[in-house]
Amino acid sequence: SETTTGTSSNSSQSTSNSGLAPNPTNATTKAAG
């Protein structure tokens, strides 16, 4: 899939995680079909 500028994180959220996509893992591989 393609995203133009991605999903922006909300600075008012309590989480301190970056809103960028995390490192890829094989668990994120798309299902076939």
Partner: antibody, heavy 118, light 107 residues
Framework: QVQLVQSGAEVKKPGASVKVSCKAS????????MNWVRQAPGQGLEWMGE????????YFNQKFKSRVTMTRDTSISTAYMELSRLRSDDTAVYYC???????????WGQGTTVTVSS | DIQLTQSPSFLSASVGDRVTITCRAS??????LAWYQQKPGKAPKLLIY???TLHSGIPSRFRGSGSGTEFTLTISSLQPEDFATYYC?????????FGQGTKLEIK
């Protein structure tokens, strides 16, 4: 050690396309997003987009969305960036860079100079 | 999109000086700011990420601080190899954005 080796310099005519390659070694190619950043002569750094090497999911800078194609070949640990409908202001050094989630753009290729001239 | 404003754009200093470069974000980016050094004809090199964490192999004279919208890069005692252009970059959200750069020149 981590290395990103890019293809050589290109000279293109306006309206043409260019495809730059970036071969990774020294780490698991599928474990990190590959980003593309360009730098026009004497100017700053401009992010173009990134690709997930497993799923091929992509995030783009809106500015390049209609002209850039990012692909990858996991069998040879190589990422590609193709820019179409070239204009003179696309003359720049194009870099690939590995993005680590916590660390950001931690390793960069040596850069590929693309010159667009009639 | 977030905007990053670096100041100053140009900085003249001498070997041994302490220098500070500032990067301001147009909205909060938490701690997610990185700093890069670039020398002419070379690729940028990561110095600091997440505001204050030194990348592996980077000398301890480089120090990053700040969070939210205001960040600083301090070089405690300039060495001859430190004269270069420095860029900040936010890694909090898409699109990834760089500051316009600060060129550090020998006085």
């Amino acid at each position: 050690q981590v290395q990103l080796v890019q293809s050589g310099a290109e000279v293109k005519k306006p309206g043409a396309s260019v495809k730059v390659s970036c071969k990774a070694s020294g780490y698991d190619f599928t474990g990190y997003h590959m980003n593309w950043v360009r730098q026009a002569p004497g100017q700053g750094l401009e992010w173009m987009g990134e690709i997930n090497p497993i799923t091929s999911d992509k995030y783009f800078n809106q500015k390049f969305k209609s002209r850039v194609t990012m692909t990858r070949d996991t069998s040879i640990s190589t990422a590609y960036m193709e820019l179409s409908r070239l204009r003179s202001d696309d003359t720049a050094v194009y870099y690939c860079a590995r993005r680590d989630y916590g660390t950001s753009l931690d390793y960069w290729g040596q850069g590929t100079t693309v010159t667009v001239s009639s | 999109d977030i905007q990053l404003t670096q100041s100053p754009s140009f900085l003249s200093a001498s070997v041994g000086d302490r220098v500070t470069i500032t990067c301001r974000a147009s909205k909060s980016i938490s701690k997610y700011l990185a700093w890069y050094q670039q020398k002419p004809g070379k690729a940028p090199k990561l110095l600091i990420y997440a505001g204050s964490t030194l990348h592996s192999g980077i000398p301890s004279r480089f120090r990053g601080s700040g969070s939210g919208t205001e960040f600083t890069l301090t070089i405690s005692s300039l060495q001859p190899e430190d004269f270069a252009t420095y860029y900040c970059q936010q890694h909090n959200e898409y699109p990834i954005i760089f500051g316009q750069g600060t060129k550090l020149e020998i006085k």
